[in-house]
């Protein structure tokens, strides 16, 4: 987590956290782009969705993602302030019934069709970082973030808190 403790220190916190209720706090549509202003796009290929990181042509429409925000308990054994320690998690859905999933075995980010309640792999802890950039940390694998690798989204392990500001795990959300 961002500027949070060393990666190992909060491992148990995310695994132990429970999402309070099944209804999101709020939901809204936004386009997702990288720190370097490349767009995250989604394409249907061979009956499955592929995720790309690319420069859009002028006036080309950006793909939108439905972000659903959930509040989750941040366990007292980590935060030290009992029931008051909380964090925000998000799910990201670019099209109906499909959600971004963390595939920790393959270190990949995939779009899976699934029904609610969503699996833990679809939840990401939200971090505000550099100015108005955000980062997405896997609920199922603390210290692992959605990042950009070879023009694709991938899961990137952040080995120490000093590397948390690395640009390839920073994203911009835009509602326009």
């Amino acid at each position: 987590a961002f500027g949070i403790s060393g990666v190992q220190k909060y491992t148990r916190a995310l695994h132990d956290s429970s999402i309070t209720g099944i209804s999101p706090i709020t939901e809204y549509l936004a386009s997702l782009s990288t720190y370097n202003d490349q767009s995250i796009t989604f394409a249907l290929e061979d009956e499955s969705y592929e995720i790309y990181v690319e420069d859009l042509k002028k006036d080309e429409k950006k793909d939108k993602v439905l972000l659903s925000y959930y509040e989750s308990q941040h366990p007292s054994n980590e935060s030290g302030d009992g029931v008051d320690g909380k964090m925000l998690m998000v799910t990201l859905s670019p099209t109906k019934d499909f959600w971004l999933h963390a595939n920790n075995k393959e270190h990949s980010v995939e779009l899976h069709k699934c029904e609610k309640p969503l699996p833990d792999q679809a939840f990401f802890v939200l971090h505000n970082m550099h100015s108005n950039c955000v980062s997405f940390e896997c609920k199922t694998d603390p210290g692992v973030f959605i990042g950009v690798k070879d023009n694709h989204l991938a899961l990137i392990k952040v080995d120490s808190s000093e590397n948390l500001c690395t640009e390839n795990i920073l994203f911009k959300l835009s509602e326009t």
């Epitope: 961002f2 500027g3 949070i4 403790s5 925000l88 505000n128 808190s161 509602e175």
Partner: antibody
Framework: EVQLVQSGAEVKKPGASVKVSCKAS????????INWVRQAPGQGLEWIGR????????SYNELFKDRVTITRDTSTSTAYLELSSLRSEDTAVYYC???????????????WGQGTLVTVSS | DIQMTQSPSSLSASVGDRVTITCHAS??????LSWYQQKPGKAPKLLIY???TLHTGVPSRFSGSGSGTDFTLTISSLQPEDFATYYC?????????FGQGTKVEIK
């Protein structure tokens, strides 16, 4: 109990620098961003910037970027605000404040220090 | 930057009155709005976060509502200890910004 305890009042001359400290206790210091907010006499609240104690990463309000340095010492669970090239309009109470949410600023500031009055006068 | 506009800037009320303070954001901030209470010589205290959620230990006479650009803080029955200045603050984007404050005075 979460506590943020700040250093004492300071009187400085124009052009000087000041460094205010904020010692955190009652929670894991590296788990929440610390923000700095100031309030000029009889005025409203103005956000200066924030630091992630675990990584030392900082985000500043552009209005203050050139004159402000925010640092931390994890061994003492202390955050610092240094303001340089002081002018009379920097006279204010400076507060440190811990964010409500782990990792993000959406939930505002759950806990505040008692404030440090910085007076800039020749 | 997102501008936050509070109204009124001050109001006079009596103990037991229902008090309403409004806050307008210059752009959509969804539910990412917090309300604070500040008494003279003291630090602000978080009352409400996420537009309508009461912070730990805050009396239930305080309530918040709204989303998008328009928000309201309501004190259902004003108590002597509620005379203070109230600030709204947006948490949608950096730089984080506050309203100019509403001073609630004794009539």
């Amino acid at each position: 109990e979460v506590q943020l305890v700040q250093s004492g009042a300071e009187v400085k001359k124009p052009g000087a620098s000041v460094k205010v400290s904020c010692k955190a206790s009652g929670y894991t210091f590296t788990s929440y961003w610390i923000n700095w907010v100031r309030q000029a006499p009889g005025q409203g609240l103005e956000w200066i910037g924030r630091i992630a104690p675990g990584s030392g990463f900082i985000s500043y309000n552009e209005l203050f970027k050139d004159r402000v340095t925010i640092t931390r010492d994890t061994s003492t669970s202390t955050a610092y605000l240094e303001l340089s090239s002081l002018r009379s309009e920097d006279t204010a109470v400076y507060y440190c404040a811990r964010e409500f949410y782990y990792g993000s600023f959406y939930g505002g500031f759950a806990y505040w220090g008692q404030g440090t009055l910085v007076t800039v006068s020749s | 930057d997102i501008q936050m506009t509070q109204s009124p800037s001050s109001l006079s009320a009596s103990v037991g009155d229902r008090v309403t303070i409004t806050c307008h954001a210059s752009q959509n901030i969804h539910v990412w709005l917090s309300w604070y209470q500040q008494k003279p010589g003291k630090a602000p205290k978080l009352l409400i976060y996420k537009a309508s959620t009461l912070h730990t230990g805050v009396p239930s006479r305080f309530s918040g509502s709204g989303s998008g650009t328009d928000f309201t803080l309501t004190i259902s029955s004003l108590q002597p200890e509620d005379f203070a200045t109230y600030y709204c603050q947006q948490g949608q984007s950096s730089p984080l910004t506050f309203g100019q404050g509403t001073k609630v005075e004794i009539k």
